[in-house]
Every structure is written in C-alpha cells, then in structure tokens.
Interface confidence: low
C-alpha cells in the first residue's frame, strides 16, 4: 500500500519537474507572432526589426517583408506579424501564385504575344484585357447557325439549325413550354416547316437540273463547291495579328 | 533588338568619383521598364547594385552601396546612370546595366549590355 | 537580405550527362527565382524565370523547379555550349544572387 503511494508520488513529481525542464529549455516557445527569440540577448522575446515579421510564435527569427516594387505595388503593407501583399499597377495583371509575377494588359479583342499586344486574327476572338484568343464557337457542330457573326472581342451568337427556321418565321425560337398531350402548336408548326424546307430542297433540284442541262456540268460543279469555301482574310493579317501555329506555346508570358 | 551599351569606367583612386552610363539603343528607356544595374568583381559571382522602377519614382540599392551610388535616368537621351562616389577597393569590379522584362516586373533581367570595368586603386 | 547558396559550387560532367543545380533560399521567396548562364568574358544570359517559365530562345533542356525556399535547375542532357558558370537570383526583396555553379568538361 505505502509502496505504491510512494510510487504515485514519484511519477507526479517526475511529471512536473518535466514540464517544468521542458519550459527552462525552450524559453523560445513562448515567443508571440511578431517577435523572435533573440539568441544575443539570452533567448528573450524581441520584437521583429523594421521590414520583417514573423507569422506564428517560437521563431528564432524574422522573415523579411516582400517589397512591392517595379510594377508592383503595395496591396496590403507589411506588419509584425503578416507579410505584405502586393498587386499591378494599372496596365498590368497579377500572374502566379501571390501574385508572384505582373504581365503586361492588352485590350479587348488582342492578346500578348512575344513582340507585344496583337489583335487576335479573323475567327478568333478575346473579350478580356488577359489571356488568349479563343475561336469563335463553331455552331454547326451543335447543329445549329450564326445568328450573330463573330468579333476580335466577342464570340458568335449560334442560333436554331437551319432546319428549324421556315420562311417568314422568327428567326430566334422562344423555349418550349412543357409539353402537353395531343398535338401542340409547336409540332404541328414543325411538320409545317419540314413539309415546306422538303418542297423547297426539291424546287432546288429541279432548278439545279435545269441549269445542267442549259449550262453544263462544270457550273454545276462549281455550284456545290463555292459554299465550302474558306473566307480569305486579309485586312488583319496584314495589321499583324497574333496567328499561333502548333509549334508555338500558348497562354505562356513572354519575358 | 533591344542594345545596352555601357561606359565611363576606368581608373579611379579610393575616395574618388565616376559616372557610368548605360545608352539604350532600340528601345525607349521610358516605356515603363525596370532597370538595374550588377556588378561581378574580378574572379568572383554576380552582385545586383541597383535598380530603378519604370516609371522612374522608385530607386533601390544595395546595401553595399546605399549613400554612395546614385542611380537615375535621361529619358530624352535614352541613358540611364550610376553615380559612384565615394569609391572603396571592393568597388572594383565590371559593371553591367541591364533591363527587366516588359510583361513583367518581377526583376529578372533579359538585355544586358557588355559591362564597363571600374578599378579603384592607389 | 534574402541569402541564396548554390550547390553544387563546381561539377564535372561529359556531354549527355543530366545535370542539377539546386539554389537554397534563407526563407521563403514564393517562386521569384531565376537562373543565369554566363560564360567567360560575356554578360549573364537569362535561362529560367517565375522558377519554372523557360526565356524565349532558350533550348528546352533546361529547366527549373521548386517553390519557397528550393530550386532545381536541370540540363537534361548536357552540349558542349552548356560548359558555362550558372546563377540564381531572386527577386523577391530586392535582388541577390547566389554564388554560382561552375559546370566543367570532364
């Protein structure tokens, strides 16, 4: 019984001198955020110098403050205890984690290239002051057509597939509304439009026949290929806008 | 192309004064560029001197040198410069002015010109 | 100052060889770091910038890594241009450069 008291004892006298060690050694955990333990002037807590801080407790010493400089400028200033922040000056963006880098604005409708701020070439477009021209949206991928032609800053507007469009109807088709049973407005207008795109494709052929048989086969020829035909753009390409081939690397910033 | 041509070093006793200049060729030194200038004694690694923001209101300067060199710039002759007063031994060394990049001003250097040596001697 | 100690301080390599290059920073610098080649009698050549974005005109070979206080700077397969002396620098306060590396022929 005695024996094991003296045990209890011994264990809690062990503990507590312990902790008490443990502190005698490590006076430098007791050091706040925004001081260091100063090793010249036996291990006290200093406050950090001008121009440094130091964000959690126990620190030998101080980090120096970043410094916002060049086309950096100052978001939030340097404390105690926090870093400073920085940020662009107007006409430049942060890039990188922190904003570790600044590059260059473009206008809308150019991107930054190696030699500078080009206009984005016919078919692509970019409506930021950053980053790349994109293509335009290619609508008939979807099924669907141009409603509003493409920009250097904006992208095309796709509206409904040709098919969907009879002569004289709205050009822009209103969502539908759920659908109810028997036959709807919508379906009956619909059978309307396919009888009436049917009547025309044949009209077409027949007129197409015509002109075969009056003006020969090679017109014929030349008739079905025009459509297909890529717009030649010159006008931009000869203000220098920024065409990227495969081999060039994109959305990286030029130094 | 962008060309740093550097000039005004030469011989000068400890105590005694110079004035580098570094003549940007195509290229407007006001076009909102950083620019430094480093320096690499004989033998010995590369030491950045000083710097000037691009827009021309912010300078920086090493230790080594702060109170003693001078870094400014003449937009209208396209030449920025180094003062160096005060001159001390240690100061001897090729100097270089170069430029931080235009999409960036996280002070890296992509033009260089060919460096002018300094040598502080009695 | 923010110190940068570059290890090693010279090697020697054949041409083909991998080579790294590590830069220790004294504290934390984010990724504002870049790497120099220069050769005898030239001015510093910029290789690396952001510590990992390759320069314009600079073979792909070389190439940087790390963030915070540790940076790589790689030559995948070492020509016999690439005999040269290579520096860090950061520029995260102001600007300070490590002591560099000299690669030499074996």
């Known amino acids: 019984m005695g024996n094991s008291c003296y045990n209890i004892v011994a264990t809690l006298l062990l503990v507590l001198n312990f902790e008490r060690t443990r502190s005698l050694q490590d006076p430098c955990s007791n050091c706040p955020a925004g001081t260091f333990c100063d090793n010249n002037r036996n291990q006290i807590c200093s406050p950090c110098p001008p121009n440094s801080f130091s964000s959690a407790g126990g620190q030998r010493t101080c980090d120096i403050c970043r410094q916002c400089k060049g086309v950096f400028r100052t978001r939030k200033e340097c404390s105690s205890t926090s870093n400073a922040e920085c940020d662009c000056t107007p006409g430049f963006h942060c890039l990188g984690a922190g904003c570790s880098m600044c590059e260059q604005d473009c206008k809308q409708g150019q991107e930054l290239t190696k030699k500078g701020c080009k206009d984005c070439c016919f078919g692509t477009f970019n409506d930021q002051k950053r980053g790349i021209c994109r293509p335009w949206t290619n609508c008939s991928l979807d099924g669907k057509s141009v409603l509003v032609n493409g920009t250097k800053e904006r992208d095309v507007v796709c509206g409904p597939s040709p098919a969907d469009l009879s002569p004289g109807a709205s050009s822009v088709t209103p969502p539908a509304p759920a659908r109810e049973p028997g036959h709807s407005p919508q379906i009956i207008s619909f059978f309307l439009a396919l009888t009436s795109t049917a009547l025309l494709f044949l009209l077409f052929f027949l007129t197409l026949r015509f002109s075969v048989v009056k003006r020969g086969r090679k017109k014929l020829l030349y008739i079905f290929k025009q459509p297909f035909m890529r717009p030649v753009q010159t006008t931009q390409e000869e203000d220098g806008c920024s065409c990227r081939f495969p081999e060039e690397e994109e959305g990286g910033c030029e130094l | 192309e962008v060309q740093l041509v550097e000039s005004g070093g030469g011989l000068v006793q400890p105590g005694g004064s110079l004035r580098l200049s570094c003549a940007a060729s195509?290229?407007?030194?006001?076009?909102?560029?950083?620019w430094g200038w480093i320096r690499q004694a004989p033998g010995k690694g590369l030491e950045w001197v000083s710097g000037i923001s691009g827009y021309g209101d912010t300078t920086y300067y090493a230790d080594s040198v702060k109170g003693r060199f001078t870094i400014s710039r003449d937009n209208s002759k396209n030449t920025l410069y180094l003062q160096l007063n005060s001159l001390r031994a240690e100061d001897t060394a090729v100097y270089y002015c170069?430029?931080?990049?235009?999409?960036?001003?996280?002070?890296?250097?992509?033009?260089w010109g060919q460096g002018t040596l300094v040598t502080v001697s009695s | 100052d923010i110190q940068l100690t570059q290890s090693p301080s010279s090697l020697s390599a054949s041409v083909g060889d991998r080579v790294t290059i590590t830069c220790r920073a004294s504290q934390g610098i984010s990724s504002a770091l870049g790497w120099y080649q220069q050769k005898p009698g030239k001015a510093p050549k910029l290789l690396i910038y952001a510590a990992s974005s390759l320069q314009s005109g600079v073979p792909s070979r070389f190439s940087g890594s790390g963030s915070g206080t540790d940076f790589t700077l790689t030559i995948s397969s070492l020509q016999p241009e690439d005999f040269a002396t290579y520096y860090c620098q950061q520029s995260y306060y102001t600007w300070t450069f490590g002591q560099g590396t000299k690669v030499e022929i074996k």
């Open positions: 195509g290229y407007s030194i006001s076009s909102g560029h950083h």
């Open positions: 170069a430029r931080d990049p235009y999409s960036s001003g996280s002070g890296y250097f992509d033009y």
